[in-house]
């Protein structure tokens, strides 16, 4: 969390941002909140990106003002116009690109004053893994697949029964470049698995950490997976 304050000249207002990550090819949110104003027409929101000449987005007098918008953001940005009056200046970024990563500034001007806060935005690709029993293999084998990751992640297997065991000798992980030549499909195979055990396939890069669990018993197979974005800090 980053909390910024306005300085000199007129009164300062508190602006708060949260560091976040965007999944390339999908839509992302750059979070920013501020002390609300009574009149929408008195609120100006300006989003900037470090190193970029034009504005990322501007909202003033109750509507978007995109005359100074930078080429790289054209047609890809929107604020939540109906939520501005309650202090939400978050920006929706469509079709997140790898090059959208960087430091952003949420700059707010209201009748109470002005303020700004920076936000670190990481971009990459992350997806939920799915773990299945590989019935085609000669021995009991698990196959963990996740369709889109970038940068290249690490894959670690763990087991509930053999906690702390190192499975690197009995697993094999491959990365296959997807058609857009950026993201990769992750496939990891774990050999010699035993029944009545829960195995976890953990995929992690500097943006996200995802885990796929599978519990194999004689009567059933239970799966569970979850994904967590890393380093989401407020400012």
């Amino acid at each position: 969390l980053i909390i910024g304050f306005g300085i000199s000249g007129r009164h300062s207002i508190t602006v708060t941002t949260v560091a976040s990550a965007g999944n390339i090819g999908e839509d992302g949110i750059l979070s920013c909140t501020f002390e609300p104003d009574i009149k929408l027409s008195d609120i100006v929101i300006q989003w900037l990106k470090e190193g970029v000449l034009g504005l990322v987005h501007e909202f003033k007098e109750g509507k978007d003002e995109l005359s100074e918008q930078d080429e790289m953001f054209r047609g890809r940005t929107a604020v939540f116009a109906d939520q501005v009056i309650v202090g939400n200046a978050s920006l929706r970024l469509k079709n997140v690109q790898l090059t959208d990563a960087g430091t952003y500034k949420c700059y707010i001007i209201t009748s109470k004053g002005k303020g700004n806060a920076n936000l670190e935005y990481k971009t990459g690709a992350f997806s939920m893994p799915e773990v299945n029993v590989d019935y085609n293999a000669s021995s009991e084998t698990l196959r963990c697949e996740a369709p889109r990751w970038f940068p290249q992640p690490t894959v670690v297997w763990a087991s509930q029964v053999d906690q702390g065991a190192n499975f690197s000798e009995v697993s094999n992980t491959s990365f296959e470049l997807n058609s857009e030549n950026v993201t990769m499909k992750v496939v990891s195979v774990l050999y010699n698995v035993t029944i009545n055990n829960t195995y976890s396939c953990m995929i992690e890069n500097d943006i996200a950490k995802a885990t796929g669990d599978i519990k194999v018993t004689e009567s059933e197979i239970k799966r569970r997976s979850h994904l967590q974005l890393l380093n989401s800090k407020a400012s």
Epitope: G6, G51, V52, M72, G102, Y107
Partner: antibody
């Protein structure tokens, strides 16, 4: 550490051409707009030209429009200024600088002197 | 093009003095103004951007204020290393014009 190093300056006759280079290091060059700013001997700063991170947008001062061309090679982390039809009034120290927020400039290179004289 | 006019063009002051430099834009530039310091034979250094935001590493005795067309750079207590030339620059629209500079000299 962010560094910008200009080169290519020197003595050139009026009507001649020169190409300045600015080698960048210590940051993701393609993410930053870049600029050329000049300073004639004993005078103030004059913004000359700017270019977006991708190279897709270029900007010029009226005094150099049609004569100077700004470009960049992101694979080489290098900014260029091609200067044609040079005039005596183009004599100056030329600085390259990185866009910080909007067109505020930080850091700057150490500068390279261009002397247009017969 | 937006014209930037600085005043005074030069001033003499003593260590410890409070110094104020003004910059006027020929049209509304909102808060998009930067201030630079330049010492003889050196490249300029960014002090303030967005009219009032101090660049990282710049001493807090420097401050900026203003919006629209009128802006001020203030040095609250002048130090020996502050004797230099100061420039304003509008950063909202190409061409990104500079003021003509203010030279701060030792009295």
């Amino acid at each position: 550490e962010v560094q910008l190093l200009e080169s290519g300056g020197g003595l050139v006759q009026p009507g001649g051409s020169l190409r300045l280079s600015c080698a960048a290091s210590g940051f993701t060059f393609s993410s930053y707009g870049m600029h050329w700013v000049r300073q004639a001997p004993g005078k103030g700063l004059e913004w000359v030209s700017g270019i977006s991170g991708s190279g897709g947008s270029t900007y010029y001062a009226d005094s150099v429009k049609g004569r100077f061309t700004i470009s960049r090679d992101n694979s080489k982390n290098t900014l260029y200024l091609q200067m044609n039809s040079l005039r005596a009034e183009d004599t100056a120290v030329y600085y390259c600088a990185r866009t910080q927020w909007r067109a505020s400039l930080d850091p700057w290179g150490q500068g390279t002197l261009v002397n247009v004289s017969s | 093009d937006i014209q930037m006019t600085q005043s005074p063009s030069s001033l003499s002051a003593s260590v410890g003095d409070r110094v104020t430099i003004t910059c006027r834009a020929s049209q509304d530039i909102s808060y998009w103004l930067a201030w630079y310091q330049q010492k003889p034979g050196k490249a300029p250094k960014l002090l303030i951007y967005g009219a009032s935001t101090l660049q990282s590493g710049v001493p807090s005795r420097f401050s900026g204020s203003g919006s629209g067309t009128d802006f001020t750079l203030t040095i609250s207590s002048l130090q020996p290393e502050d004797f230099a030339t100061y420039y304003c620059q509008q950063t909202t629209m190409s061409p990104y014009t500079f003021g003509q500079g203010t030279k701060v000299e030792i009295k």
